[in-house]
Structure formats: structure tokens, C-alpha cells
Amino acid sequence: KESCDVQLYIKRQSYHSIFAGDPFKLECPVKYCAHRPQVTWCKLNGTTCVKLEGRHTSWKQEKNLSFFILHFEPVLPSDNGSYRCSANFLSAIIESHSTTLYVTDVKSASERPSKDEMASRPWLLYS
């Protein structure tokens, strides 16, 4: 019998290399059974995760999974950092792994680096 616990499918130590000025959607895949849980996004500040209030979020439904999406319209250099989604389910809080956004500010980059360059060397991006 399949578990009916809420599960959040963000991979541990995942990251996204993105450019300031571009739109970006950060997705939190959510698996649930009967009732869709309340889901929120927060941004890590040291060991504290600060809830993101008043941001554009939306839901996308696919066959076996729902996605709670945080919209960046557009990405700003200050969006660099680690994010986590959390689900409120049966009075319990289920937290995802954090995922990191490495933001390249194209104004300060002499030329737009390739995805491969950024993917293999994220330490070249904002720390």
C-alpha cells in the first residue's frame, strides 16, 4: 500500500544557474493523496528560513504530482541563495531539501556564460 504522507520532491543539494533579468519559475513538486496541503516557500538566512510573503506563487497540476511554483519576474541579483518549500499537513510541517539559485548578473559579466560553464563551476557565480 502506497504511503499517503505528503512528500516534497526537491533533490538534496540541487541548484539552478540562472541570469538576472530573466523570468524563472522555482518548482516544489508535491505528492499528496486526498487534500492538497498548504505549501509555502522560504529563503534561508543562515540557519533560519524566512517565509516569503506577498510573492507571486501558483499551482500546476500534473498526472501524479502537483507543483507549487514561486515566480521570479524577473530574477534579481538579490534572489541568489537557498530556498525551501514546506507543507502543512495534519498539523505537521514537512520540509523539503533546500535548493540553491546561483544568479549571474549579466551586467557585470563580460559575456553571458554557457549553461555548462555555470553548471560545472557554480563557485564562479555569486557566493
Epitope: Y9, I10, K11, S14, S17, H97, S98, K115, A119, S120
Partner: antibody
Amino acid sequence: QVQLQESGPGLVKPSGTLSLTCAASGVNIKDTYMYWVRQPPGKGLEWIGRIDPANGYTRYNPSFKSRATISADKSKNQASLKLSSVTAADTAVYYCAVYDGYYESFDVWGQGTLVTVSS
Amino acid sequence: DIQMTQSPSSLSASVGDRVTITCRSSQSLLDSDGKSYLNWLQQKPGKAPKRLIYLVSKLDSGVPSRFSGSGSGTDFTLTISSLQPEDFATYYCWQGTLFPRTFGQGTKLEIK
């Protein structure tokens, strides 16, 4: 169950490029991380790097500088390793491995393939 | 890089013995999620390594309960409560907390 099968030439010439492929079955690789580890004859294990097949993003061991390239093909459910400018010191058994990226619930290694660097 | 140091490097023991292998990391393996990503592998001659234990103490499916893992921070142990003939192998610890991933040098467990 999750299984991995490595393939590629067992002999590579010095200064050439080592190329290996790792085909996965029993799992959709987009839900995993795939990684490569090598083991020189009679020695210990050395982590080369890993890929997130969902988006192609990679992490490498700096000791391989820019010689290693890991890629993945979701449509074929496989990952590949290329190691350039090889020397005799790169002679080793090369293993690919795969693990659950979400909950670490499985970690499976391929059988390994011995690659000898020699002219 | 995190250095992983195992001791002993080799160990002779008899069937039925209780055996402990230790692994020390050069820095804490405690991740920001409060978990330590410390794994133990078993490797038999000519074979691929096989994960026995992950997250310090969780046993992989199919691994006999005579294997156990413990520890925190920088000090970890693998214990085999009663050695069986099939347990004679080389054991490696490795960390999955920071990049690059790093392995201990291995502990070869031999029959006395």
C-alpha cells in the same frame, strides 16, 4: 530493481580521452543523481563527480581539474563520463553509481569496468 | 576537502567475533538539515562496492541486522555484532555532506 551497466573501451592511449557509458534500468534517472568513482588497482576509491540528470547540472572533484565531463541522456536513461588527457595514472576500475536524490533510499553501483591507459 | 580516516587499516578476526571499525572526518558531517551524510560500503575482491549503511545508522534493505552504524559530528563506527564468513571484505566509509565526496582509505577484514 535498480541496475547499472557500464560500457566502453578497456584500453586508451596516453593523452587520449577515456569514454564510458552507464545505462540504468529499474529507475527513471531524472529522479536520481548519477555519479562516477574510480579505483586504481589495489587502491582505494576516488569520487570523480556527479550529475543531476533532470537538468544536466554537474559537480566535479577539483582534483580532476577540467579533464572530466559527465553528461546524461534522459531519453536513453544513461549517463556518460569523458576523461581527457589521460596518463598511466588514470588506469583504474571505473564505477558508475546512482542514488535516490530525494530521500537517499537507494544507492546502487555498476559492476565496474577496468580501463588501462597504455600505448 | 574533508579527510576521512579509518582505523584500523586491516583487522584479523574470527567467525562469531564482534568487530568495530572507526571513521573520523576532518570536519563535522552535520548538514544544514540536521543530518550527517555518512555511508558505509562493503567491497569483496573483484566486485563493486555495495552500500550497507547510510545517514550514519540506517541499514540498506537486505543488509543483515548484525551490521550497525553509530556516531555523530566527526566520529563514526561500523559494528558487526557476530562475524559471518561472508563478512570478510574491505569496508569503506564515505561522506556525502560536502563536495567533493571523499572516502576513507578502507579497512580490510581478514580471517584469523
